[in-house]
Protein backbone atom coordinates (compact mmCIF):
# COMPACT_ATOMS: atom_id res chain seq x y z
CA UNK A 1 0.00 0.00 0.00
CA UNK A 2 1.49 3.33 -1.06
CA UNK A 3 1.67 5.93 1.70
CA UNK A 4 0.23 9.36 0.95
CA UNK A 5 1.83 12.36 2.62
CA UNK A 6 -0.83 14.81 3.76
CA UNK A 7 -0.81 18.04 5.72
CA UNK A 8 -3.18 20.93 6.37
CA UNK A 9 -3.75 23.36 3.51
CA UNK A 10 -1.89 26.64 3.59
CA UNK A 11 -3.55 29.88 4.72
CA UNK A 12 -3.53 30.80 1.02
CA UNK A 13 -6.31 28.24 0.55
CA UNK A 14 -8.58 29.59 3.32
CA UNK A 15 -12.14 29.31 2.06
CA UNK A 16 -11.27 26.79 -0.64
CA UNK A 17 -13.56 24.11 0.79
CA UNK A 18 -17.04 25.54 1.27
CA UNK A 19 -18.40 22.80 3.53
CA UNK A 20 -15.48 20.62 4.52
CA UNK A 21 -11.88 20.35 5.60
CA UNK A 22 -9.02 21.24 3.25
CA UNK A 23 -6.09 18.84 3.19
CA UNK A 24 -2.94 19.13 1.10
CA UNK A 25 -1.90 15.96 -0.70
CA UNK A 26 1.82 16.70 -0.81
CA UNK A 27 2.97 14.03 -3.27
CA UNK A 28 0.11 14.80 -5.64
CA UNK A 29 0.70 18.56 -5.38
CA UNK A 30 -2.96 19.30 -4.81
CA UNK A 31 -5.51 20.43 -2.29
CA UNK A 32 -8.38 18.11 -1.47
CA UNK A 33 -11.68 18.82 0.26
CA UNK A 34 -12.96 16.28 2.77
CA UNK A 35 -16.66 17.12 2.72
CA UNK A 36 -19.04 17.32 5.65
CA UNK A 37 -21.92 14.86 5.64
CA UNK A 38 -24.50 15.98 3.09
CA UNK A 39 -22.08 17.83 0.83
CA UNK A 40 -20.30 16.82 -2.36
CA UNK A 41 -18.29 18.36 -5.20
CA UNK A 42 -14.59 19.17 -5.61
CA UNK A 43 -14.98 22.04 -3.14
CA UNK A 44 -17.93 20.59 -1.17
CA UNK A 45 -20.13 23.16 -2.85
CA UNK A 46 -23.14 20.93 -3.54
CA UNK A 47 -25.68 19.97 -0.91
CA UNK A 48 -27.50 16.72 -1.37
CA UNK A 49 -30.34 15.47 0.77
CA UNK A 50 -31.17 11.80 0.85
CA UNK A 51 -34.96 11.67 0.84
CA UNK A 52 -36.48 8.62 2.50
CA UNK A 53 -39.85 7.92 0.92
CA UNK A 54 -42.62 7.53 3.55
CA UNK A 55 -44.38 4.19 3.54
CA UNK A 56 -47.51 4.22 1.38
CA UNK A 57 -50.91 3.71 3.02
CA UNK A 58 -51.23 0.08 2.02
CA UNK A 59 -48.14 -0.76 4.06
CA UNK A 60 -49.27 1.04 7.18
Amino acid sequence: VAQVSITKCSSDMNGYCLHGQCIYLVDMSQNYCRCEVGYTGVRCEHFFLTVHQPLSKEYV
Epitope: S10, S11, D12, M13, G15, Y16, L18, S29, Q30, N31
Partner: antibody, heavy 116, light 106 residues
Protein backbone atom coordinates in the same frame (compact mmCIF):
# COMPACT_ATOMS: atom_id res chain seq x y z
CA UNK B 1 -5.60 17.58 -21.39
CA UNK B 2 -5.70 20.61 -19.08
CA UNK B 3 -4.86 23.91 -20.72
CA UNK B 4 -4.85 27.63 -19.99
CA UNK B 5 -4.88 29.60 -23.25
CA UNK B 6 -4.26 33.32 -22.98
CA UNK B 7 -5.17 36.11 -25.39
CA UNK B 8 -2.65 37.55 -27.83
CA UNK B 9 -0.05 40.30 -27.45
CA UNK B 10 -1.25 43.86 -26.95
CA UNK B 11 0.28 47.29 -27.58
CA UNK B 12 -1.20 50.11 -25.51
CA UNK B 13 -0.60 53.79 -24.98
CA UNK B 14 0.21 55.23 -21.52
CA UNK B 15 -2.98 55.92 -19.56
CA UNK B 16 -4.98 53.27 -21.40
CA UNK B 17 -6.30 49.98 -20.01
CA UNK B 18 -5.68 46.39 -21.08
CA UNK B 19 -7.77 43.28 -20.50
CA UNK B 20 -6.06 39.89 -20.81
CA UNK B 21 -8.13 36.72 -21.02
CA UNK B 22 -7.27 33.20 -19.84
CA UNK B 23 -9.49 30.40 -21.15
CA UNK B 24 -9.39 27.07 -19.37
CA UNK B 25 -10.06 23.71 -20.97
CA UNK B 26 -9.97 20.22 -19.50
CA UNK B 27 -11.06 21.45 -16.06
CA UNK B 28 -13.62 23.72 -14.44
CA UNK B 29 -12.24 27.03 -13.15
CA UNK B 30 -14.81 26.89 -10.32
CA UNK B 31 -12.71 24.06 -8.84
CA UNK B 32 -9.62 26.29 -8.69
CA UNK B 33 -8.19 29.68 -7.87
CA UNK B 34 -6.78 31.65 -10.82
CA UNK B 35 -3.70 33.70 -10.01
CA UNK B 36 -2.08 36.40 -12.15
CA UNK B 37 1.68 36.91 -12.27
CA UNK B 38 3.69 39.31 -14.40
CA UNK B 39 7.31 39.61 -15.53
CA UNK B 40 8.83 42.79 -16.92
CA UNK B 41 11.65 42.36 -19.48
CA UNK B 42 14.79 41.13 -17.73
CA UNK B 43 13.06 41.29 -14.34
CA UNK B 44 11.71 38.82 -11.81
CA UNK B 45 8.27 37.31 -11.28
CA UNK B 46 5.66 39.43 -9.51
CA UNK B 47 2.37 38.13 -8.09
CA UNK B 48 -0.51 40.51 -8.85
CA UNK B 49 -3.59 38.88 -7.39
CA UNK B 50 -6.09 36.07 -7.68
CA UNK B 51 -9.74 35.20 -8.01
CA UNK B 52 -11.84 32.43 -6.56
CA UNK B 53 -14.28 31.95 -9.48
CA UNK B 54 -16.76 29.97 -7.36
CA UNK B 55 -17.17 32.57 -4.60
CA UNK B 56 -16.22 35.42 -6.95
CA UNK B 57 -13.90 36.94 -4.35
CA UNK B 58 -10.55 38.50 -5.18
CA UNK B 59 -7.27 39.29 -3.43
CA UNK B 60 -4.78 41.79 -4.84
CA UNK B 61 -1.21 42.72 -4.08
CA UNK B 62 -1.26 46.07 -2.32
CA UNK B 63 0.74 47.89 -5.00
CA UNK B 64 -1.89 47.01 -7.65
CA UNK B 65 -4.96 47.74 -5.52
CA UNK B 66 -7.29 50.12 -7.36
CA UNK B 67 -5.57 49.60 -10.72
CA UNK B 68 -6.13 45.89 -11.33
CA UNK B 69 -9.43 44.04 -11.64
CA UNK B 70 -9.56 40.26 -11.87
CA UNK B 71 -12.83 38.68 -12.97
CA UNK B 72 -14.10 35.30 -14.09
CA UNK B 73 -16.91 34.12 -16.35
CA UNK B 74 -17.74 30.59 -15.26
CA UNK B 75 -20.13 30.11 -18.19
CA UNK B 76 -17.19 30.35 -20.62
CA UNK B 77 -14.59 28.97 -18.19
CA UNK B 78 -12.52 32.12 -18.65
CA UNK B 79 -10.68 34.44 -16.26
CA UNK B 80 -9.68 38.04 -17.01
CA UNK B 81 -7.15 40.52 -15.70
CA UNK B 82 -7.69 44.21 -16.44
CA UNK B 83 -4.98 46.75 -15.65
CA UNK B 84 -5.78 50.45 -15.95
CA UNK B 85 -3.78 53.71 -16.06
CA UNK B 86 -0.99 51.92 -17.90
CA UNK B 87 2.55 53.25 -17.75
CA UNK B 88 5.76 52.12 -19.44
CA UNK B 89 6.76 50.09 -16.35
CA UNK B 90 3.70 47.89 -16.97
CA UNK B 91 5.35 46.48 -20.09
CA UNK B 92 5.59 42.80 -19.20
CA UNK B 93 4.51 39.27 -19.91
CA UNK B 94 1.33 38.51 -17.94
CA UNK B 95 0.64 34.92 -16.90
CA UNK B 96 -2.48 33.29 -15.52
CA UNK B 97 -1.82 30.41 -13.14
CA UNK B 98 -4.18 27.73 -11.86
CA UNK B 99 -3.89 26.60 -8.26
CA UNK B 100 -6.01 24.45 -6.00
CA UNK B 101 -6.76 21.10 -7.58
CA UNK B 102 -3.26 21.07 -9.05
CA UNK B 103 -0.27 23.06 -7.94
CA UNK B 104 0.48 26.02 -10.18
CA UNK B 105 -0.26 25.17 -13.78
CA UNK B 106 0.69 28.15 -16.01
CA UNK B 107 -0.72 29.72 -19.16
CA UNK B 108 1.64 30.56 -22.03
CA UNK B 109 1.81 34.26 -21.16
CA UNK B 110 0.63 37.46 -22.87
CA UNK B 111 3.04 40.25 -23.76
CA UNK B 112 1.64 43.71 -23.04
CA UNK B 113 3.71 46.60 -24.38
CA UNK B 114 3.02 50.14 -23.17
CA UNK B 115 4.49 52.70 -25.51
CA UNK B 116 3.61 56.17 -26.74
CA UNK C 1 2.68 40.97 2.79
CA UNK C 2 5.31 38.29 3.33
CA UNK C 3 8.71 39.27 1.90
CA UNK C 4 11.06 36.69 0.37
CA UNK C 5 14.76 37.53 0.29
CA UNK C 6 16.59 35.31 -2.18
CA UNK C 7 20.38 35.08 -2.40
CA UNK C 8 22.65 35.24 -4.24
CA UNK C 9 21.14 37.23 -7.13
CA UNK C 10 23.60 35.55 -9.49
CA UNK C 11 26.31 32.91 -9.34
CA UNK C 12 28.85 31.30 -11.61
CA UNK C 13 29.87 27.67 -11.09
CA UNK C 14 31.58 24.86 -12.95
CA UNK C 15 29.90 21.77 -14.35
CA UNK C 16 29.71 19.19 -11.56
CA UNK C 17 29.75 21.81 -8.79
CA UNK C 18 27.25 21.83 -5.94
CA UNK C 19 25.08 24.96 -6.12
CA UNK C 20 23.05 26.33 -3.21
CA UNK C 21 20.43 29.09 -3.26
CA UNK C 22 18.69 30.39 -0.14
CA UNK C 23 15.39 32.13 0.50
CA UNK C 24 14.52 33.83 3.77
CA UNK C 25 10.90 34.67 4.56
CA UNK C 26 9.88 37.65 6.69
CA UNK C 27 7.75 35.27 8.81
CA UNK C 28 7.20 31.54 9.27
CA UNK C 29 5.80 30.10 6.01
CA UNK C 30 5.24 26.57 7.40
CA UNK C 31 7.18 24.84 4.58
CA UNK C 32 4.87 26.28 1.90
CA UNK C 33 7.65 27.16 -0.51
CA UNK C 34 8.13 26.17 -4.15
CA UNK C 35 11.12 26.47 -6.47
CA UNK C 36 10.91 27.33 -10.16
CA UNK C 37 13.38 27.19 -13.03
CA UNK C 38 13.00 29.68 -15.87
CA UNK C 39 14.91 29.70 -19.13
CA UNK C 40 14.86 32.73 -21.49
CA UNK C 41 11.62 33.06 -23.43
CA UNK C 42 9.89 30.31 -21.48
CA UNK C 43 7.29 30.20 -18.73
CA UNK C 44 8.62 29.13 -15.32
CA UNK C 45 8.83 25.38 -14.69
CA UNK C 46 7.91 24.03 -11.26
CA UNK C 47 10.70 21.89 -9.80
CA UNK C 48 9.82 21.53 -6.12
CA UNK C 49 6.83 22.30 -3.92
CA UNK C 50 6.18 22.02 -0.19
CA UNK C 51 9.90 22.61 0.53
CA UNK C 52 11.26 19.30 -0.74
CA UNK C 53 8.74 17.44 -2.92
CA UNK C 54 10.22 16.97 -6.38
CA UNK C 55 7.81 17.20 -9.31
CA UNK C 56 7.51 14.23 -11.70
CA UNK C 57 10.25 14.23 -14.31
CA UNK C 58 12.55 16.56 -12.37
CA UNK C 59 16.09 15.13 -11.99
CA UNK C 60 17.10 14.01 -8.50
CA UNK C 61 20.10 16.36 -8.50
CA UNK C 62 17.60 19.08 -7.52
CA UNK C 63 16.56 19.17 -3.88
CA UNK C 64 15.08 21.49 -1.29
CA UNK C 65 15.10 21.77 2.47
CA UNK C 66 14.26 24.12 5.32
CA UNK C 67 11.58 25.14 7.79
CA UNK C 68 10.30 28.22 9.55
CA UNK C 69 11.73 31.21 7.72
CA UNK C 70 14.87 29.69 6.15
CA UNK C 71 14.88 27.55 3.00
CA UNK C 72 17.54 26.14 0.70
CA UNK C 73 17.52 24.90 -2.89
CA UNK C 74 20.42 22.73 -4.04
CA UNK C 75 21.71 21.40 -7.34
CA UNK C 76 24.04 18.59 -6.28
CA UNK C 77 26.00 18.44 -9.55
CA UNK C 78 25.50 21.36 -11.95
CA UNK C 79 24.82 20.37 -15.56
CA UNK C 80 24.98 22.62 -18.67
CA UNK C 81 21.18 22.36 -19.09
CA UNK C 82 20.71 23.83 -15.59
CA UNK C 83 21.71 27.29 -16.82
CA UNK C 84 18.62 29.34 -15.95
CA UNK C 85 17.15 31.71 -13.39
CA UNK C 86 15.68 30.11 -10.26
CA UNK C 87 12.90 31.59 -8.14
CA UNK C 88 11.44 30.69 -4.77
CA UNK C 89 7.74 31.24 -4.14
CA UNK C 90 5.98 31.31 -0.77
CA UNK C 91 2.35 30.26 -0.91
CA UNK C 92 1.54 30.13 2.79
CA UNK C 93 -0.29 33.46 2.79
CA UNK C 94 -1.17 34.74 -0.66
CA UNK C 95 1.99 34.60 -2.80
CA UNK C 96 5.39 36.23 -2.98
CA UNK C 97 8.33 35.40 -5.24
CA UNK C 98 11.97 35.80 -4.33
CA UNK C 99 14.04 38.09 -6.53
CA UNK C 100 15.59 35.25 -8.52
CA UNK C 101 19.07 33.75 -8.89
CA UNK C 102 20.74 33.65 -12.29
CA UNK C 103 22.95 30.55 -12.58
CA UNK C 104 25.79 30.62 -15.12
CA UNK C 105 28.59 28.24 -16.07
CA UNK C 106 32.16 29.28 -15.34
Amino acid sequence: QDQLVQSGAEVKKPGASVKVSCKASGFNIKDTYIQWVRQAPGQGLEWMGRIDPLRRNTKYREKFEGRVTITADTSTNTAYMELSSLRSEDTAVYYCVRSGTRFDFWGQGTLVTVSS
Amino acid sequence: DIQMTQSPSSLSASVGDRVTITCKASQDIHKYIAWYQQKPGQAPRLLIQYTSTLQPGVPSRFSGSGSGTDYTFTISSLQPEDIATYYCLQYDNLRTFGGGTKVEIK
